[in-house]
């Protein structure tokens, strides 16, 4: 594959990333399918600057990130480590609520309305952003 | 790397109490929900008690609801399990472990007997 | 409560066999279920979570499938170091509860 030098139509360049951002909802499941078959994945916080940056054009919309802990530890979906890595919960958050009654606790990070960070459970229909890296390889085969 | 190390397990007569603690490292503690699991003398495993990240939520087995206190101090890394009122049936190797059983601790021996 | 039932209780397996232990929840859990492994006198290792998540570092030779209500984890080819203690676990509502264990024993 090629270097992808330019962001996609509809999507917002940002720091050699590309950013989409969607106006309606899916489940966590869904909304990460969705952008690994934009050859993308949701967003990964890693820095003040990027939150800052997907908080502006999301505006106060419950967001899906790339952020879970389905199967016990909290992992980012491009590898990035969540450890050493740059965290904005909300205070008290994440608390892996059972009150819901949905089953399980709540296993799927998003932006709240104030940008902080929750967990909540993966089934809800959230907004969603897809992210990739400018600089990576792309599938397409480059253009003869 | 992920470290859960319990103490504060012994030798107690029923009634009596004992505070069982586990320090933890290699993580950030106050992301994850902990919890206490027992296992009786040649006996599976038993279920005791969680608390979320920032303790708002605890949760207990019947068989210690009223008689057991789980806290953590996410300052000091460590959660800790307060046992009041033991009985015989208590006596187990008690577990910490993390968020649904990731990781687990080498556990600590709490005998109840007179 | 929860009541999850695991079977065979034990079972005796050579070297190289494949090895399959069921696990059966009393109502629906969906994917809400772990498998440990436990050794005599050792704390329980996590195998598997959302019933067939294999966790970071075990060996693929491991698998866990199901949702609902039946759930199974296999061996593919047991090896010396897999004769132990087997447990499921579910964590879709409080308390959380545990098979009783199925002993993997060597035939």
């Known amino acids: 594959g090629s270097e992808r030098t330019c962001c996609p139509v509809n999507w917002v360049e940002h720091e050699r990333s590309c950013y989409w951002f969607s106006r309606s909802g899916k489940a966590w499941a869904d909304a990460d399918n969705y952008c690994r078959l934009e050859d993308a994945h949701l967003v990964v916080v890693t820095s003040w600057e990027e939150q800052k940056f997907v908080q502006h054009h999301i505006g106060p919309v419950n967001t899906w990130m790339g952020l879970h802990d389905q199967n016990g530890p909290w992992k980012w979906v491009d590898g990035t480590d969540y450890e050493t890595g740059f965290k904005n919960w909300r205070p008290e958050q994440p608390d892996d609520w059972y009150g819901h009654g949905l089953g399980g606790g709540e296993d799927c990070a998003h932006f709240t309305d104030d940008g902080r960070w929750n967990d909540d459970v993966c089934q809800r229909p959230y907004r969603w952003v897809c992210e990739t890296e400018l600089d990576k390889a792309s599938q397409e085969p480059p253009l003869l | 790397e992920v470290q859960l190390v319990e103490s504060g397990g012994g030798l107690v007569k029923p009634g009596g109490s004992l505070r069982l603690s586990c320090a933890a490292s290699?993580?950030?503690?106050?992301?994850?929900?902990m919890n206490w699991v027992r296992q009786a003398p040649g006996k599976g495993l038993e279920w005791v008690s969680s608390?979320?990240?920032?303790?708002?939520?605890?949760y207990y087995a019947d068989s210690v609801k009223g008689r057991f206190t789980i806290s953590r101090d996410n300052a000091k890394n460590s959660l800790y399990l307060q046992m009041n009122s033991l009985r015989t049936e208590d006596t187990a190797v008690y577990y910490c472990?993390?968020?649904?059983?990731?990781?687990w601790g080498q556990g600590t021996q709490v005998t109840v007997s007179s | 409560d929860i009541q999850m039932t695991q079977s065979p209780s034990s079972l005796s397996a050579s070297v190289g066999d494949r090895v399959t232990i069921t696990c059966r929840a009393s109502?629906?859990?969906?994917?809400?279920l772990a498998w440990f492994q436990q050794k005599p006198g050792k704390a329980p290792k996590s195998l598997i979570s959302?019933?067939?998540s294999l966790q970071s570092g075990v060996p693929s030779k491991f698998s866990g499938s199901g949702s609902g209500t039946d759930f199974t984890l296999t061996i593919s080819s047991l090896q010396p170091e897999d004769f132990a203690t087997y447990y499921c676990?579910?964590?879709?509502?409080?308390?959380?509860?545990f098979g009783q264990g199925t002993k993997v024993e060597i035939n």
């Open positions: 472990a993390r968020d649904r059983g990731s990781y």
């Open positions: 290699g993580f950030t503690f106050s992301s994850y929900s």
């Open positions: 109502q629906d859990i969906s994917n809400y």
């Open positions: 676990q579910q964590y879709h509502s409080y308390p959380w509860t």
């Open positions: 608390i979320s990240g920032s303790s708002t939520y605890k």
């Open positions: 959302a019933a067939s």
